[in-house]
Interface confidence: low
């Protein structure tokens, strides 16, 4: 349906206050280096635009579309130019183009400092000194840092934030209510960036036909008793909300994904038995609750696949009539009966089924030549099993900081290239996996594991893009989304990589080692572990958890003297010989 | 299997000096931190002092600093302790632990124990 004004539609539609926050977070995610004062003023500027075309919605520039409106309002900022360079050559390209070109120049690793938390009392007295704008700069800080966030899930996350201030400010132990909270919706927000990072990823590298057939796969797993129309009707549905997210149509994204709320809650009946708490709540914790949603119980007496795939003469028949409508029903029917497996790994047995009729159907006898298909899968699952079961056994014994460990020395031999701050950053991730989905029972590991490692492996793409340094991560991250995961499970070490020049200067530390957190210091012994392998990618695992041990010795040695900085200095000299002997640098 | 084996315990007075020394076997010694510990009558099991795989690194729990020194001899597979202006605090079940990565004091990182030797500081 066809508005006069489409600013005007979205207003009306998300209210006063939805609007401001997705404008925010809109210009937030596209100009990541802007001041926070600079985003308010243009967002108060749209507002009042929007106003007057609710009150008129013939009102000159009325008609035009949020790309323009939008895109012109970013184009008045002074220091475009400067602060962001070749982005400011965005203005002089008409829509879509000009908004094409803003979202290639989305930064996912930003050059922003890191954010501190300040003391708690100092954090409440802000909130209560002006909450709206305490609230506008959690969605300003997160949104600029993560320009993907999904940005109806981010209101959500404003909210729950809101809530642990307004609960924990009044508290008589405020550090103790307020801090686990934050925590936690830290470690919720980063995982929920992460995600939706793959999404957009999968949209934007891989087209909507590789979106769909995931949400296919992923909705035919949660909604086994839904009908395949069902299932194909929210799929479309879904496709519009995140590809109008992912393009930067966060208006449209946000008032699609409640429409779809609305809609899968009016009939759930006919999706899902799992609905009923979910739909009980408000708008945003609504959609939230619908997109965690647990799997709803297989119907029973479900039929075999291999009947309709396999046996049926009319396979070829049915295939050649609607090749797309007979793979996603087949899709469909494998996940709603295998909740046990990872999504990509219902990708992958879909793809091979697709490349077998396509080979067969142009056969002489194709029942013959297709009658085996089934067979093809049992090495496609085995695969990830094993694996899995295998890292989980590591897991078990090592614990997560040095499984962590042991991933990093595996990740550092196979692109040796990638800077070492991304190989850290995704290694902990990665080893993240173990405490995340090991406990789980094995009908449970593998979505768990696999679908999870697909998230963080998308993180190690989308950095590596941006500045690309190995060949061989561009050709894992590239040739085949579903099959990332496999291709850098058989990366050998690289055996092209030249060592880097042993530098002392990586292997000096000082004494505000000792004042880290826990977590920062892992970070840093990690950093030099990293920094060890490419000095010597050929250094055995015995030879590197002696250099380990001895620098955590060193530290904890040095932590524990009179003169901290002067043991650093001393003792530090002593481990780089060390090292350098014990690996034969 | 892997043993560990205590001796050197045994009564000294205060002032004294004993060597406790902890033979290894069934594992790659080199490949092994090693600490010892000890246990008083009715307290609780506690970190005396660890060095790590090559030997270059030590830990030493204040209580003992400046009077016990710990070495190993990778060649032999044992570990030393030389405890020296023993006091009668120092009164304990010694044992033996190996860690297979550096331990920062939790005993629940040493992997492998000794059955202890006793250590009397009396007058």
């Known amino acids: 349906d066809a508005h006069k004004s489409e600013v005007a539609h979205r207003f009306k539609d998300l209210g006063e206050e939805n609007f401001k926050a997705l404008v925010l977070i809109a210009f937030a995610q596209y100009l990541q280096q802007c001041p926070f004062e600079d985003h308010v003023k243009l967002v108060n500027e749209v507002t009042e635009f929007a106003k007057t075309c609710v009150a008129d919605e013939s009102a000159e520039n009325c008609d035009k579309s949020l790309h323009t409106l939008f895109g012109d309002k970013l184009c008045t900022v002074a220091t475009l130019r400067e602060t962001y360079g070749e982005m400011a050559d965005c203005c002089a390209k008409q829509e879509p183009e000009r908004n094409e070109c803003f979202l290639q120049h989305k930064d996912d690793n930003p050059n922003l400092p890191r954010l501190v938390r300040p003391e708690v009392d100092v954090m409440c007295t802000a909130f209560h000194d002006n909450e709206e704008t305490f609230l506008k700069k959690y969605l300003y800080e997160i949104a600029r840092r993560h320009p993907y966030f999904y940005a109806p899930e981010l209101l959500f996350f404003a909210k729950r934030y809101k809530a642990a201030f307004t609960e924990c400010c009044q508290a008589a132990d405020k550090a103790a209510c307020l801090l686990p909270k934050l925590d936690e919706l830290r470690d919720e927000g980063k995982a929920s960036s992460a995600k939706q990072r793959l999404k957009c990823a999968s949209l934007q590298k891989f087209g909507e036909r590789a979106f769909k057939a995931w949400a296919v796969a992923r909705l035919s797993q949660r909604f086994p008793k839904a009908e395949f129309a069902e299932v194909s009707k929210l799929v479309t549905d879904l496709t519009k909300v995140h590809t109008e997210c992912c393009h930067g149509d966060l208006l449209e994204c946000a008032d699609d994904r409640a429409d779809l709320a609305k809609y899968i809650c009016e009939n759930q009946d006919s999706i899902s038995s799992k609905l009923k708490e979910c739909c009980e709540k408000p708008l945003l914790e609504k959609s939230h609750c619908i997109a965690e949603v647990e799997n709803d119980e297989m119907p029973a007496d479900l039929p075999s696949l291999a009947a309709d795939f396999v046996e049926s003469k009319d396979v070829c028949k049915n295939y050649a009539e609607a090749k797309d409508v007979f793979l996603g029903m087949f899709l469909y029917e494998y996940a709603r009966r295998h909740p046990d497996y990872s999504v990509v790994l219902l990708l992958r047995l879909a793809k091979t089924y697709e490349t077998t009729l396509e080979k067969c159907c142009a056969a002489a006898d194709p029942h013959e030549c297709y009658a085996k298909v089934f067979d093809e899968f049992k090495p496609l699952v085995e695969e990830p099993q094993n694996l899995i079961k295998q890292n989980c056994e590591l897991f078990e014994q090592l614990g997560e900081y040095k499984f962590q460990n042991a991933l990093l020395v595996r990740y550092t031999k196979k692109v040796p290239q990638v800077s070492t701050p991304t190989l850290v950053e995704v290694s902990r991730n990665l080893g993240k996996v173990g405490s995340k989905c090991c406990k789980h029972p094995e009908a449970k590991r593998m979505p768990c594991a696999e679908d999870y490692l697909s998230v963080v492996l998308n993180q190690l793409c989308v950095l590596h893009e941006k500045t690309p340094v190995s060949d061989r991560v561009t050709k894992c991250c590239t040739e085949s989304l579903v099959n990332r995961r496999p291709c850098f499970s058989a990366l050998e070490v690289d055996e092209t990589y030249v060592p880097k020049e042993f530098n002392a200067e990586t292997f000096t530390f000082h004494a505000d080692i000792c004042t880290l957190s826990e977590k920062e210091r892992q970070i840093k012994k990690q950093t030099a572990l990293v920094e060890l392998v490419k000095h010597k990618p050929k250094a055995t695992k015995e030879q590197l958890k002696a250099v380990m041990d001895d620098f955590a010795a060193f530290v904890e040695k040095c932590c524990k003297a009179d003169d901290k900085e002067t043991c650093f200095a001393e003792e530090g000299k002593k481990l780089v010989a060390a090292s350098q002997a014990a690996l034969g640098l | 299997d892997v043993q560990l084996v205590e001796s050197g315990g045994g009564v000294v007075q205060p002032g004294g000096s004993l060597r406790l020394s902890c033979a290894a076997s069934?594992?790659?010694?080199?490949?092994?931190?090693m600490g010892w510990f000890r246990q008083a009558p009715g307290k609780e099991r506690e970190r005396v002092v660890s060095?790590?795989?090559?030997?270059?690194?030590?830990y030493y729990a204040d209580s003992v600093k400046g009077r016990f020194t710990i070495s190993r001899d990778n060649s032999e597979n044992t570990v030393y302790l030389q405890m020296n202006s023993l006091r009668p605090e120092d009164t304990a079940l010694y044992y033996c632990?190996?860690?297979?990565?550096?331990?920062?004091?939790?005993?629940?990182?040493?992997?492998?124990w000794g059955q202890g030797t006793l250590v009397t500081v009396s007058s």
């Open positions: 069934g594992l790659t010694f080199s490949s092994y931190a």
């Open positions: 060095i790590s795989r090559g030997g270059g690194y030590t």
């Open positions: 632990a190996a860690a297979r990565y550096w331990a920062t004091g939790s005993e629940y990182e040493f992997d492998y």
